[in-house]
Amino acid sequence: SQVSQNCHNGSYEISVLMMGNSAFAEPLKNLEDAVNEGLEIVRGRLQNAGLNVTVNATFMYSDGLIHNSGDCRSSTCEGLDLLRKISNAQRMGCVLIGPSCTYSTFQMYLDTELSYPMISAGSFGLSCDYKETLTRLMSPARKLMYFLVNFWKTNDLPFKTYSWSTSYVYKNGTETEDCFWYLNALEASVSYFSHELGFKVVLRQDKEFQDILMDHNRKSNVIIMCGGPEFLYKLKGDRAVAEDIVIILVDLFNDQYFEDNVTAPDYMKNVLVLTLSPGNSLLNSSFSRNLSPTKRDFALAYLNGILLFGHMLKIFLENGENITTPKFAHAFRNLTFEGYDGPVTLDDWGDVDSTMVLLYTSVDTKKYKVLLTYDTHVNKTYPVDMSPTFTWKNSKLPNDITGRGPQ
């Protein structure tokens, strides 16, 4: 049913879904704090622009009686229940922030006539791609896939002279929400990644992974997995690894690699870590002090969601345009706005662009070092270390298939 929006006459409200099922186990209080900090910034920016309006947030909590798994498995209905709650109360803001689970976002998008924008900190799965009124402020699976294909094909760097066309993917079903959807996208037979690779096998058992490390008959030297170094250690331990194995560890939302005095453990020497470039001020800002390095990005996405709304509100008000229109709902894409920690760019489909960073472990210094960066906006790789102090022979990444010569 059509719900009237609390979104006119100088008063603009943001509906924030505070769901029990969330992409990251972040206390809702921290998300509230992030939203409130964002509101303060937005009010200041609007005031500076001479716009005398009120901006508030309404936090919509689910009762948690039915949907209490805490992760995303039972989120599908929780999102719809919250929308029903909003509908019954006849209280919808100009914009909806949350949900973060792919299941709930997909279902809410499917089952509602969305004439308002939806901003998500999460919704990583491919099923949430190309949604006209959905904006995602954390890197979705599609962006990861494009990096991997780009990197696999690269063969003109001093440290990577072979194109790769094969891979193992380790996916055992215990992954976090972000990893679940990232690996899901790599596994999907119809995805861009699968389409571009000649060989790809999913390893589902710990033993399968462990066996591959020294298997002379393996079909690929490259293994993709998702999680932190501890996750890898639990799986790999101190087992011997063939010298031409390359493990790509996807750990996007983890700033720990960049903290002072971090030393890479020995078991990381065969590993390239794919993570996101950390914000400069975030490393010691008051906002992030109480958050773990992994959860910083999640709370930051909520905060940036508020700033994005403020940015769009300012533009529409300055142009004398109506906020409760399809034009406003479809406007949250193909733009750059001032985020909490610098400019944030959204692509044509409302998905955040970022700089991904591929790290290696220096055998000289036992420190993580940047091998290359990748700009998701232009799908381009920028090498940083032309002769890395790798564990691999001749400071070069091996071929993906043992014994295959130059291509």
């Epitope: 000289d364 940047v370 270390d385």
Partner: nanobody, 127 residues
């Protein structure tokens, strides 16, 4: 004091390219933040670009998109690739190092942040 040696300068036509290198003896350069500076005749020394210990780079607005800074860790060298050179790029180019994990490479390198300097290499852009 760390011994830094710059090389690769010379005379080049506008629109041309040069690659400067900064090498260190007896020190592992990738343990430090490296800054490149330049000083044109009669002008203050200014920051051009830097690379932090972990490998993040930053550039002055005047050189963004034209200059690229990268490492060659195994050679213990840092390179400054300069493309689309302009007459106003004419200067003596210096490299400098400082410890500290982040130092000022998130921002433009400031002179006072760097403790060891090379002798400089002259770049002249002229037709």
């Amino acid at each position: 004091q760390k011994q830094l040696v710059e090389s690769g300068g010379g005379l080049v036509q506008p629109g041309g390219s040069l690659r400067l290198s900064c090498a260190a003896s007896g020190e592992t350069l990738s343990n430090y933040n490296i800054g490149w500076f330049r000083q044109a005749p009669g002008k203050e020394r200014e920051g051009v670009s830097c690379i932090s210990q972990i490998g993040f780079t930053n550039y002055a607005d005047s050189v963004k998109g034209r200059f690229t800074l990268f490492r060659a860790s195994a050679e213990n060298t840092v390179y400054l690739q300069m493309n689309s050179l302009k007459p106003e790029d004419t200067a003596v180019y210096y490299c400098a190092v400082t410890g500290g994990r982040w130092a000022s490479c998130s921002f433009l390198p400031l002179r006072q942040d760097f403790e060891s300097w090379g002798q400089g290499t002259l770049v002249t852009v002229s037709s």
